[in-house]
């Protein structure tokens, strides 16, 4: 791995908690200000593997609201606008980090948590298993 | 919003830092143990809008490695295995939270940061039709 020289201006940490417990500034720095806001707003409808977005809310988690994609069809939309069941709509999933309040209901103490979310859907060719 | 009753066992917080700076336990709780590890391992190749995965590494960020999808084609793969340029392969993007070391090179002090990542690609129909 890459060794990072320690900055002498770092906050102190007690050995018993270090490196498991860290200080995190929740004032979010958003690196996405240069992106096009239209970037994917209508893909869920225009895709050959369209999806619906479901709101998942949990006040004990940060961010408290996460949107989950659910593919609308088992197959994919063909050029005629019909569902082609020779193809499969599948969710594209990603592991993301969230903060979970720990102990519960504490406003300033969290634990890092990994969750799997479906971001959208894509159309794939099925793997056909032939039975002799 | 939902008001959460405060747990009397919460760590203390100084008003000057609260609620911007919080304590976070980095021992990750993984909620994904029941997921199929193969869940989307080959979708990038089997999709009608296939993609390559690009490793993005930054030692000042947690997680330090993020995989970014890059769509392989301008169009989408049709039933004959050729690229159909009347369709578009587009990246499905998601804003995710990461931790950025702040001040730089500090092992136990971070700031929350939002970044936009491309998770995979999907095939969409254009809404503006080409005039020859």
């Amino acid at each position: 791995g890459i060794t990072i020289p320690r900055n002498p201006g770092c906050p102190n940490s007690e050995d018993k908690n270090f490196p498991r417990t860290v200080m995190v500034n929740l004032n979010i720095h958003n690196r996405n200000t240069n992106t096009n806001p239209k970037r994917s707003s209508d893909y869920y409808n225009r895709s050959t593997s369209p999806w619906n977005l479901h709101r998942n809310e949990d006040p004990e988690r940060y961010p408290s609201v996460i949107w989950e994609a659910k593919c609308r069809h088992l197959g994919c939309i063909n050029a005629d606008g019909n569902v082609d069941y020779h193809m499969n709509s599948v969710p594209i999933q990603q592991e993301i980090l969230v903060l979970r309040r720990e102990p519960p209901h504490c406003p300033n103490s969290f634990r890092l948590e990994k969750i799997l979310v479906s971001v959208g859907c894509t159309c794939v060719t099925p793997i056909v298993h032939h039975v002799a | 919003g939902i008001t959460i009753p405060r747990n009397p066992g919460c760590p203390n917080s100084e008003d000057k830092n609260f609620p911007r700076t919080v304590m976070v336990n980095l021992n990750i709780h993984n909620r994904n143990t029941n997921t199929n590890p193969k869940r989307s391992s080959d979708y990038y190749n089997r999709s009608t809008s296939p993609w390559n995965l690009h490793r993005n590494e930054d030692p000042e960020r947690y997680p330090s490695v993020i995989w970014e999808a890059k769509c392989r084609h301008l169009g989408c793969i049709n039933a004959d295995g050729n690229v159909d340029y009347h369709m578009n392969s587009v990246p499905i993007q998601q804003e995710i939270l990461v931790l950025r070391r702040e001040p730089p090179h500090c092992p136990n002090s971070f700031r929350l940061e939002k970044i936009l990542v491309s998770v995979g690609c999907t095939c969409v129909t254009p809404i503006v039709h080409h005039v020859a």
Partner: nanobody, 125 residues
Framework: EVQLVESGGGLVQAGGSLRLSCAAS????????MGWFRQAPGKEREFVAA????????AVATFVKGRFTISRDNARNTVYLHMSSLKPEDTAVYHC??????????????????WGQGTQVTVSS
Amino acid sequence: EVQLVESGGGLVQAGGSLRLSCAASGRTLYSYPMGWFRQAPGKEREFVAAISMSGDDTAVATFVKGRFTISRDNARNTVYLHMSSLKPEDTAVYHCAARTSYSGRYDYIDDYSYWGQGTQVTVSS
């Protein structure tokens, strides 16, 4: 913001070759499909070539097919336009652009949001 800077233009004789470069700063170029467009005096800007995010797929306008190719080096954050068998009618200002939306096909100019200032290519007979 993404800043795009073209270079490599110049004066060349008919039948000659040039390689145009488009270097990006700001967000990494691999986040976008890229395109080259050109604008001749008194004419509208027209599509020349496009390349996918990964660089695996390219498309060129029919009037430059077999003469122009597009490539990219994501590690260097640079896109290239390789031009050979140049003709006087290829004289124009060549612009590179980053595609940020997908309303039309790869050659739909309005889908490209980030543009360079352009580099002049002059082909003499």
